[in-house]
């Protein structure tokens, strides 16, 4: 049987054979991949990149969250959507997951001017069906998925909006485990609205296999702030394996080449 994909840290600390990022298959060796380093001064301002409109993000829900063996994932099940933000159509929220390390300087997938952050949160959305502008795009959409990426850094205060998620981690240490979070809204996880005005935009891929090149990325400039103990909880409570021998951390794909693509900013 073909080895399953994994992160470098898993291959280093496990006896199970697995495919590290440089050996990922599917579309992962193509040339419009994510994540990337964003050179903030090279990104051109595009006036079309206006504010986002969040629908259902403010509704308190009891979300299901699971350890999927690669990350912790909240199942959003179309209960929220986004529009605006220079996107061509409304997009339905599918899932939210995060990437992290056990150190402050290397947990994010994207970097800004060469600088990585402690974590990165991805809210993954799919374009509402029947909203593509032309036949070619409908058949081969480069923006079928919209990911909102939020960089996370350490602050001095506990971020209360993240507590339901952080507290749920203890219930899902092993892969395939799931639990229900205490009631919360997606808005609780986001920075204040005025901090969502500044963002970067480029076309790329999923950062995990099969690395499909159909993602319109939005990377927000202003990081979310979590307390150090909230950040460390992810690497302390979660494991890649059912034996709980390999702590879940460094679930970060290495940076990919920008190539001929351009990054624009709001």
């Amino acid at each position: 049987a073909e080895s399953h994909w994994c992160y470098e840290v898993q291959a280093e600390s496990s006896n199970y054979p697995c495919l590290v990022p440089v050996k990922w298959g599917g579309n992962c060796q193509k040339d419009r991949q994510s994540p990337i380093n964003i050179v903030t001064t090279k990104a051109k301002v595009d006036k079309k990149l206006g504010r986002f409109f969040f629908s259902g993000y403010d509704k308190k829900q009891t979300w299901t969250v699971q350890n999927n063996g690669h990350s912790v994932m909240m199942l959003l099940e179309n209960k929220a959507s986004i529009s605006g933000g220079g996107l061509p159509a409304p997009y339905q929220a599918k899932q939210l997951h995060l990437h992290w390390s056990d150190l402050p300087y290397k947990g994010s997938e994207h970097s800004l001017d060469g600088e990585h952050f402690a974590m990165e949160m991805h809210i993954v959305h799919e374009k509402e069906k029947g909203t593509s502008r032309n036949v070619k795009e409908a058949q081969d959409p480069e923006d079928e998925i919209a990911v909102l990426a939020f960089l996370v850094e350490a602050g001095t205060q506990v971020n209360e909006g993240f507590q339901p998620l952080v507290e749920a981690l203890s219930n899902i240490p092993k892969p395939e485990m799931s639990t229900t979070m205490a009631e919360s809204s997606l808005l609780d996880l986001l920075p204040k609205e005025e901090k969502l005005r500044h963002y970067f935009r480029y076309l790329g891929s999923l950062t995990t296999p099969t690395c499909d090149e159909k993602v319109v990325w939005t990377v927000f400039r202003e990081p979310i702030q979590l307390h150090r103990e909230q950040i460390l909880a992810f690497s302390q409570k979660l494991y890649y394996d059912k034996e709980q021998t390999v702590s879940m951390k460094d679930n970060v794909r290495p940076l990919q080449q920008l190539g001929q693509r351009t990054v624009i900013k709001s």
Partner: antibody, heavy 119, light 107 residues
Framework: DVQLVESGAELVRPGTSMKMSCKAS????????IEWIKQRPGQGLEWIGV????????HYNEKFKDKATLTADKSSSTAYMQLSSLTSDDSAVYFC????????????WGQGTTLTVSS | QIQITQSPAILSVSPGERVSFSCRAS??????IHWYQQRTNGSPRLLIK???ESISGIPSRFSGSGSGTDFTLSINSVESEDIAVYYC?????????FGAGTKLELK
Amino acid sequence: DVQLVESGAELVRPGTSMKMSCKASGYAFTNYLIEWIKQRPGQGLEWIGVINPGSGGTHYNEKFKDKATLTADKSSSTAYMQLSSLTSDDSAVYFCAREGDYGARFDYWGQGTTLTVSS
Amino acid sequence: QIQITQSPAILSVSPGERVSFSCRASQSIGTRIHWYQQRTNGSPRLLIKYASESISGIPSRFSGSGSGTDFTLSINSVESEDIAVYYCQQSNSWPTTFGAGTKLELK
């Protein structure tokens, strides 16, 4: 009371290796990162690297990644730094410090270990 | 990496005087600057965090200000025990970097 107690002064020969220690007390050792800093005589402070004692994860200043190896022993609440292929440039005082915030200030420091490399 | 410039290299003051130390970052770092005191043959001691936040146990004569690229540590009435080297450290970007220090001397 939070305390970091470092091992004593060392005189070593060029080309050899040495390992210094930093014993922590007065707080939960695995909840805070331990940083290592170099200070040459009459000079300023230079960051070497950091270890997460809970996980063993490390990160190094590029300048020191082939020079220093950081480890930690949870059972004794002790962090270690090994320095290899020693030269006179490595003669310095080495401090361990606790990172008070994640990726920020250093709120408690050890008393320093003086390393002299001489033949 | 972010460069930190401290000035002056040496400050000479008389006891009771007010003194200010300057620290400049090569790019904007918000308020992510921290100040340390290092007495002769001692280890650094945290005086001020995040540009202006006080530390418990540190005398109230020490204060800090500034944001962006320019920061100041002040001692409003110098005492003989304040004779030391003062360092600033930026924690905005990895790797963290320190200034070269300012030495405080008594006239």
